[in-house]
């Protein structure tokens, strides 16, 4: 399955919007920083084929979308930027979903990447737990925003490596 040429441009636009969403200086939230244990190995792109990689990327984008479409998220961010950000994510989800479906049709087994998807789910569980513990404070959201920028940029790198493999 070939992702549309525009897909990596959408990724960069998503990152740009997330960067613009910053409301307070991260430097005022130094003590709130947290290691969420991003499952780096699932995004290294060396040890697995394209099909599982796409479904792990899909899971990552889906979880980010879920996180930023909550009621608490709406209260934390600029409405217009949040709306644009979520629209971009939704578009990427559609692109990735079409690829996931196509791979399933040609018989790619979903079992081969179940562990990777579980690792992504656990990562977002840790993020949600952190936000809850910090009572969705502005600094907690700022820390999460920086973390999502890191994971999004890593996933962008993976997608570009996958495209080069085609």
């Amino acid at each position: 399955c070939d992702l549309p040429e525009t897909h990596s441009l959408d990724n960069r636009r998503t990152l740009m919007l997330l960067a613009q969403m910053s409301r307070i200086s991260p430097s005022s939230c130094l003590m709130d920083r947290h290691d969420f244990g991003f499952p780096q190995e699932e995004f290294d792109g060396n040890q697995f084929q394209k099909a599982p990689a796409i479904s792990v990327l899909h899971e990552l984008i889906q979880q980010i979308f879920n996180l930023f479409t909550t009621k608490d998220s709406s209260a934390a961010w600029d409405e217009d930027l949040l709306d644009k950000f979520c629209t971009e994510l939704y578009q990427q989800l559609n692109d990735l979903e079409a690829c996931v479906m196509q791979e399933e049709r040609v018989g790619e087994t979903p079992l081969m990447n179940a562990d990777s998807i579980l690792a992504v789910k656990k990562y977002f569980r840790r993020i949600t737990l952190y936000l809850t513990e910090k009572k969705y404070s502005p600094c907690a959201w700022e820390v999460v925003r920086a973390e999502i920028m890191r994971s999004l940029s890593l996933s962008t790198n993976l997608q570009e490596r996958l495209r080069r493999k085609e």
Partner: antibody, heavy 120, light 111 residues
Framework: QVQLQESGTVLARPGASVKMSCKAS????????MHWVKQRPGQGLEWIGV????????TYNQKFKDKAKLTAVTSANTAYMELSSLTNEDSAVYFC?????????????WGQGTTVTVSS | DIVLTQSPASLAVSLGQRATISCRAS??????????MHWYQQKPGQTPKLLIY???NLESGVPARFSGSGSGTDFTLNIHPVEEEDAATYYC?????????FGSGTKLEIK
């Protein structure tokens, strides 16, 4: 590729002000924090402060709060640092550096440095 | 401010041997799983270059002979085996709290 092009050598009188520039290319200027670092001849490095070009947000080392002023012009992809009330202690090389990995606050790309010499 | 004390101030190491540089912080720079200590290399007449971030993560493109370790207040940069091109001054930097500060540097000479 990422490049940070700094303005050239500056010679200034004690008490004067100087404004140096750092033109960024090869990346999205508005989405990366930009640090400024001082290095006196034969000495170590000192962190002056950081600016977020996207919204002009700044954070300073208290030591430089009344000495340095950080600004950015996004349309020109350029960050600026103005130093005021210059003394001999301000004679140094000043680097602009791009922030790395968001809130890890480390520096991956460095400009070539602007040499400021304060002399009467 | 957190003071970073680097030792030794200078060292001379034979080609192929191990160079060990220490950086001690006056206060812990580790929090919630991350150690906010980073290492740079500066060669004469050049700009500093990022080697290691978050105490032990090797920056992309940096040779694997460089490694970092430590947490809390004590951190170490190891270079093994040392090569000719490693002659430089090495600085640690923390980003645990404001203001960010650098160590005074360690000058490495290759014998």
């Amino acid at each position: 590729q990422v490049q940070l092009q700094e303005s050239g050598t500056v010679l200034a009188r004690p008490g004067a002000s100087v404004k140096m520039s750092c033109k960024a290319s090869g990346y999205s200027f508005t989405t990366y924090w930009m640090h400024w670092v001082k290095q006196r001849p034969g000495q170590g490095l000192e962190w002056i402060g950081v600016i977020y070009p996207g919204n002009g947000d700044t954070t300073y080392n208290q030591k430089f709060k009344d000495k340095a002023k950080l600004t950015a012009v996004t349309s020109a992809n350029t960050a600026y640092m103005e130093l005021s009330s210059l003394t001999n202690e301000d004679s140094a090389v000043y680097f602009c550096t791009r922030n790395y990995k968001y809130d890890y606050y480390t520096m991956d790309y460095w400009g070539q440095g602007t040499t400021v010499t304060v002399s009467s | 401010d957190i003071v970073l004390t680097q030792s030794p101030a200078s060292l001379a190491v034979s080609l192929g041997q191990r160079a060990t540089i220490s950086c001690r912080a006056s206060k812990s720079v580790s929090t919630s799983g991350h150690s906010y200590m980073h290492w740079y290399q500066q060669k004469p007449g050049q700009t500093p270059k990022l080697l290691i971030y978050l105490a032990s993560n090797l920056e992309s493109g940096v040779p694997a002979r460089f490694s970092g370790s430590g947490s809390g207040t004590d951190f170490t940069l190891n270079i093994h085996p040392v090569e000719e091109e490693d002659a430089a001054t090495y600085y640690c930097q923390h980003s645990g709290e404001l203001p960010f500060t650098f160590g005074s540097g360690t000058k490495l000479e290759i014998k």
